[in-house]
């Protein structure tokens, strides 16, 4: 009786279980009662990443420099090319099909995590005692100046965007 299901790394065709092609190879001929499945390696610019019965290999992803992309890892016959973004840019999606500039943290916010090729800058509000007066993709919130350590007094209170202003103590 012909099979209705096949083992792992096999597929059913013409009431017969044929071996799948190994990763990195495509199908050129199905098996028959007398012959095994025939496969052929993918060419240099192509890949197949699973045991398969595909008659065509997939093209490697192209990391388009016009979109700010560069190769992070070159593809093989079994793996796709992995793209990342040039310095100062990060991917717009997990599949990294295009890049955008890292965002800057506005005054009052500091950099919690510097951006990478695949993730944007993460900003955080400057807590009490800290400030940021610049728009930056690198600068963290900085602590207010300690007037006391300079034998000075606070003349103007700091905010999340400004440092304190220190001045001399009044002589009485």
């Amino acid at each position: 009786e012909p099979p209705t299901a096949c083992r792992e790394k096999q597929y059913l065709i013409n009431s017969q279980c044929c071996s799948l092609c190994q990763p990195g190879q495509k199908l050129v001929s199905d098996c028959t009662e007398f012959t095994e499945t025939e496969c052929l390696p993918c060419s240099e610019s192509e890949f197949l990443d699973t045991w398969n019965r595909e008659t065509r290999c997939h093209q490697h992803k192209y990391c388009d420099p016009n979109l700010g992309l560069q190769v992070q890892q070159k593809g093989t016959s079994e793996t796709d090319t992995i793209c990342t973004c040039e310095e100062g840019l990060h991917c717009t999606s997990e599949s990294c099909e295009s890049c955008v500039p890292h965002r800057s943290c506005l005054p009052g916010f500091g950099v919690k995590q510097i951006a990478t090729g695949v993730s944007d800058t993460i900003c955080e509000p400057c807590p009490v005692g800290f400030f940021s007066n610049v728009s930056s993709a690198f600068e963290k919130c900085r602590p207010w100046t300690s007037c006391e350590t300079k034998d000075l007094v606070v003349q103007q209170a700091g905010t999340n965007k400004t440092d304190v202003v220190c001045g001399p103590q009044d002589r009485q």
Epitope: Q22, G24, Q25, V28, S29, T35, E38, C42, T76, S77
Partner: antibody, heavy 121, light 113 residues
Framework: QVQLQESGPGLVKPSETLSLTCTVS????????LHWIRQPPGKGLEWIGV???????DYNPSLKSRVTISKDTSKNQVSLKLSSVTAADTAVYYC???????????????WGQGTLVTVSS | DIVMTQSPDSLAVSLGERATINCKSS????????????LAWYQQKPGQPPKLLIY???TRESGVPDRFSGSGSGTDFTLTISSLQAEDVAVYYC?????????FGQGTKLEIK
């Protein structure tokens, strides 16, 4: 035993279509693929294309727009057609049996004697 | 396409001596999943069709004398005839069977010195 025999006109005029037939015996075209290869006089080997045992074809991109390979399994024959020929297509044309060694490995294990085709007016 | 380049173009070796033919491919013929190299060698004697000697770089076709051996990996390959016989005079071709279009080297003519 395995045998392959190429046949067809030895002289073809420029711009016409070259037509050759490979007749095989000792194996079935449903079990083995068949390649066409050519060799210009005094030169090296150039792979033209293959018809796999399942019937699908692969061609050399340099000839793809001009070449067609087909088969008639009941007659044990494979045909090669090459259109719009020029003097550069003058060569000995061979057919060869494909052997599959597993793991995606293919080679040409039996060859016909070849037939010389001259393109000239 | 994968370009195959053989060296030397011609070679003269004394009977009983070792003959070595080199073949270089423009890209790797090593399949990373199964670690096999997809290279074949053919012998063509004058007035005859080519004859398959070796496939998968080093596997001799049945009936081929064991004086013929193949080696190499990636892009660099060698055919060695350990002790040249008179009947080995021929042109030798390497061929990549990695993927279509299958391509041949330009051939190396082997003669007796």
């Amino acid at each position: 035993q395995v045998q392959l025999q190429e046949s067809g006109p030895g002289l073809v005029k420029p711009s016409e279509t070259l037509s050759l037939t490979c007749t095989v015996s000792g194996f079935s075209l449903t079990t083995y693929g068949l390649h066409w290869i050519r060799q210009p006089p005094g030169k090296g080997l150039e792979w033209i294309g293959v018809i796999w045992r399942g019937g699908n074809t692969d061609y050399n991109p340099s000839l793809k727009s001009r070449v067609t390979i087909s088969k008639d399994t009941s007659k044990n024959q494979v045909s090669l057609k090459l259109s719009s020929v020029t003097a550069a297509d003058t060569a000995v044309y061979y057919c060869a049996k494909n052997s599959y060694y597993g793991q995606g490995g293919h080679a040409m294990d039996y060859w016909g004697q070849g037939t010389l085709v001259t393109v000239s007016s | 396409d994968i370009v195959m380049t053989q060296s030397p173009d011609s070679l003269a070796v004394s009977l009983g001596e070792r003959a070595t033919i080199n073949c270089k491919s423009s890209q790797s013929l090593l399949h990373s999943f199964n670690q096999k190299n997809y290279l074949a060698w053919y012998q063509q004697k004058p007035g005859q069709p080519p004859k398959l000697l070796i496939y998968f770089t080093s596997t001799r076709e049945s009936g081929v004398p064991d004086r013929f051996s193949g080696s190499g990996s990636g892009t660099d390959f060698t055919l060695t005839i350990s002790s040249l016989q008179a009947e080995d005079v021929a042109v030798y071709y390497c061929q990549q069977h990695y993927t279509t279009p299958f391509t041949f080297g330009q051939g190396t003519k082997l003669e007796i010195k």
